[in-house]
Interface confidence: low
């Protein structure tokens, strides 16, 4: 590390004196200063001398040697003060730019140590600091504003109090610039636009950044337009607004819309589509089938897809029948949207009954007009099935009726012993009816059917089951004879 | 500041007329639909009327439908509210306020920033 | 055009949390903002789209909204709090702006 000869930190003299600095170090040594007038350098090898004979309140500042060649960048400074009484201040530089938050150091320099009690900083014409303005003072180095805020950017002047009146120093400029995290934010609304032929129309297309240097357009597909700009400080930030309003709008207006704001950090764009109609439009879809098919007792949730412009005027849900005249209660009619002109409208019908098959209409209105989306519900049901004996055309015949949705199918068990229902361990014989007689079939409703066994005899001690089963269930009807004589003629005409 | 300032009330008979008026300040106002909502004296709130951005669509409670009319002048930065055949139930303090229509996720709309109000007496 | 169902008045004790409920059918399928109006003064929103804040109002309001309750939650109540509080919906079907009755909010001393 090199040695300063003065071997002191600091050292004070008046304008006029002779003022040496000799500093020694194993190799080449440098010095490095505040830029002031009347200094001497002499180097020779391993030391550096600075010299003048004539010290000036300029030369006030701290004086720093190095030795480049050393890998541990070592060094040694020594303050000198030159304390001129018609000069308390040796101002270093008379602008200052800095960013947002960073530190500001103001240089400006005590020439009297002694005068440290008495130092203020202020703002030119004798105007207070602004509040919140948070300072600490070195004589060394001059007041330093801490974490600098944009509203700072001020002329500034450092006061010392010399025999009870106050000398200022030269003024001294702090810029604080705003630090640009990005390109500009931007605003593009409405994201979506749609419009009748004549109506009017509006764009805007707003940016915002820390800085006022950006600029921002606006263009229709590939055509720059000229619109006014706006321009607003707001919440500390600039904002520049180009707002396109369209009396009446006509085709040549649709299409892409893109709003550009650039600054120094880059580029950023955002765009929207522009479409213009002919008329008022309303169309309604669905993803789901029209014809639904829901087991009794779940639910089910029917979701209609609305395309409008202008917006809807009204809308609901009905129930068309065919069974009771109750209609979807509205809390169970739900809309939401995706975009402006896109809603999705949702009706849940939880745990069905009997009486909620049929039609459902979801009724939408706007200027264009009417528009209904019909959902036909079926509900399924697993077969009931009942079985009678009698006679027909003169021949015992075992009758199984079988209700359900879908269309039930038929098979015939016959068994040994009696029992509810057949086991395979018991089976006799198996009949199986592929085209049972349908006795009713009507939308909405269970499907019956009817199948016939014909038995001459019953047998004692067997059992003849129907069994009846679709997609949803199966169900069955054990029928046990009584005796074997009790069923073997026709009942009384 | 966000300003909106109503004037325009008073005394009036049964019967009677009268206009109110809504300046904004220091936000851009036709950028935002607007409403009119009134509170009798001891009373909730309740909606009176509201305006699209541009004017093109405009709404009413049911209460005040045929009889009031609801315009506004984008160029003065003002909203108003023609009071025709007035009657004692409509004595009220009314609000002019900006009105935010949302749809996203949801359609929605509230009311963002309110005036003082300007009071009504409808009285014989 | 369904009406929307608050409680006349609720009172809670300083440092406490408040509750006020704002029903109606299906609610939650609809957005809901909460007004604060204290004597002599316009309203003011405190919470917008079910549970958003404007901003200036304190953290410690909050809001939620379910089935067929939306709830304004004041946690910490302070005496600054007493007013009365308005819920607000949006009647999709007949474009019209719907208010709750209103409930007033008493801080104990």
């Known amino acids: 590390i090199p040695v300063i000869e003065p071997s002191v930190p600091e050292l004070v003299v008046k304008p006029g004196a002779t003022v040496t600095l000799r500093c020694v170090g194993n190799g080449s040594v440098e010095w490095d200063g505040p830029p002031s007038p009347h200094w001497t350098l002499y180097s020779d090898g391993s030391s550096s001398i600075l010299s003048t004979n004539n010290a000036t309140f300029q030369n006030t500042g701290t004086y720093r040697c190095t030795e480049p060649g050393d890998p541990l960048g070592g060094s040694a400074a020594i303050h000198l003060y030159v304390k001129d009484p018609a000069r308390p201040w040796n101002v270093l530089a008379q602008e200052v730019v800095v960013f947002e938050d960073q530190d500001a150091l103001l240089p400006c320099l005590l020439t009297d140590p002694v005068l440290e009690a008495g130092v203020s900083l202020v703002r030119v014409r004798g105007r207070p600091l602004m509040r919140h303005t948070n300072y600490s003072f070195s004589p060394w180095h001059g007041f330093t504003i801490h974490r600098a805020k944009f509203i700072q950017s001020q002329d500034y002047q450092c006061s010392a109090l010399m025999g009870g009146r106050k000398v200022m120093s030269i003024s001294i400029r702090l810029k604080v610039q705003k630090v640009i995290p990005g390109p500009p934010a931007l605003t593009l609304v409405p994201a979506e636009l749609v419009r009748i032929r004549g109506e009017a129309a509006q764009i805007v297309c707003s940016a915002s950044s820390v800085d006022v240097n950006f600029d921002v357009f606006l263009q229709h597909n590939n055509t720059k337009l000229a619109i006014p700009q706006q321009s607003d400080f707001h919440n500390n930030r600039y904002q520049k607004v180009l707002t396109l309003n369209l009396d009446q709008v006509d085709f040549q207006h649709a299409g892409n819309y893109s709003c550009v704001a650039s600054n120094v950090q880059g580029k950023h764009s955002t765009s929207m589509f522009f479409r213009v109609v002919e008329s008022a439009y309303l169309n309604l879809s669905s993803e789901q089938n029209l014809i639904q098919e829901v087991t009794v007792g779940e639910g089910l949730n029917l979701k209609v897809m609305v395309e409008a412009y202008p917006g809807l005027q009204g809308f609901n849900w009905t129930y068309l029948g065919p069974f009771s005249d109750h209609q979807p209660e509205p809390k169970l009619a739900n809309a939401t949207t995706k975009d402006t002109y896109r809603h999705t409208f949702t009706l849940s019908l939880p745990r069905l009954k009997p009486s909620e098959a049929g039609r459902y209409s979801f009724l939408a209105r706007n200027p264009g007009g009417w528009r209904a989306l019909t959902f036909e519900l079926t509900l399924r049901y697993p077969p009931e099935v009942s079985v009678i004996w009698t006679f027909i055309n003169g021949s015992g015949t075992l009758l199984c009726a079988a209700s359900g949705y879908p269309q039930p199918n038929v098979t015939w068990l016959q068994c040994s012993g009696h029992t509810d229902r057949c086991d395979e361990a018991q089976v006799l014989q198996v009949w199986d009816d592929p085209y049972p007689e349908v006795l009713s079939q009507e939308p909405f409703h269970k499907v019956t059917v009817q199948s016939l066994l014909t038995v001459e005899t019953l047998e004692h001690n067997q059992t003849y089951e129907c069994r009846a089963h679709n997609s949803v269930g199966s169900g069955s009807w054990a029928f046990i004879p009584i005796s074997a004589g009790a069923h073997t003629h026709p009942p009384d005409e | 500041q966000v300003q909106l300032v109503e004037s325009g009330g008073g005394l009036v008979r049964p019967g009677g007329s009268l206009r109110l008026s809504c300046a904004a300040s220091?936000?851009?106002?036709?950028?935002?639909?607007m409403s009119w909502v009134r509170q009798a004296p001891g009373k909730g709130l309740e909606w009176v009327s509201a305006?699209?951005?541009?004017?093109?669509?405009?709404n009413y409670a049911d209460s005040v439908k045929g009889r009031f009319t609801i315009s506004r002048d984008n160029a003065k930065n003002s909203l108003y509210l023609q009071m025709n055949s007035l009657r004692a139930e409509d004595t009220a303090l009314y609000y002019c306020?900006?009105?935010?229509?949302?749809?996203?996720?949801?359609?929605?709309?509230?009311?963002?920033?309110w005036g003082q109000g300007t009071l009504v007496t409808v009285s014989s | 055009q369904a009406g929307l169902t608050q409680p006349p008045s609720v009172s809670v004790a300083p440092g406490q949390t408040a509750r006020i409920t704002c029903g109606g059918n299906?609610?939650?399928?609809?957005?809901v903002h909460w007004y604060q109006q204290k004597p002599g003064q316009a309203p003011v929103l405190v919470v917008y789209?079910?549970?958003d804040r404007p901003s200036g109002i304190p953290e410690r309001f909050s809001g939620s909204n379910s089935g067929n309750t939306a709830t304004l939650t004041i946690s910490r109540v302070e005496a600054g709090d007493e007013a009365d509080y308005y819920c607000?919906?949006?009647?999709?079907?007949?474009?019209?702006?719907?208010f709750g009755g209103g409930t007033q909010l008493t801080v104990l001393q």
């Open positions: 306020a900006s009105t935010v229509e949302v749809a996203h996720r949801r359609l929605y709309k509230y009311l963002e920033v």
């Open positions: 220091e936000f851009t106002f036709d950028d935002y639909a």
């Open positions: 305006i699209s951005w541009n004017g093109g669509s405009t």
């Open positions: 299906n609610i939650g399928s609809k957005s």
């Open positions: 789209g079910d549970s």
């Open positions: 607000q919906v949006w009647d999709i079907s007949s474009d019209h702006v719907v």
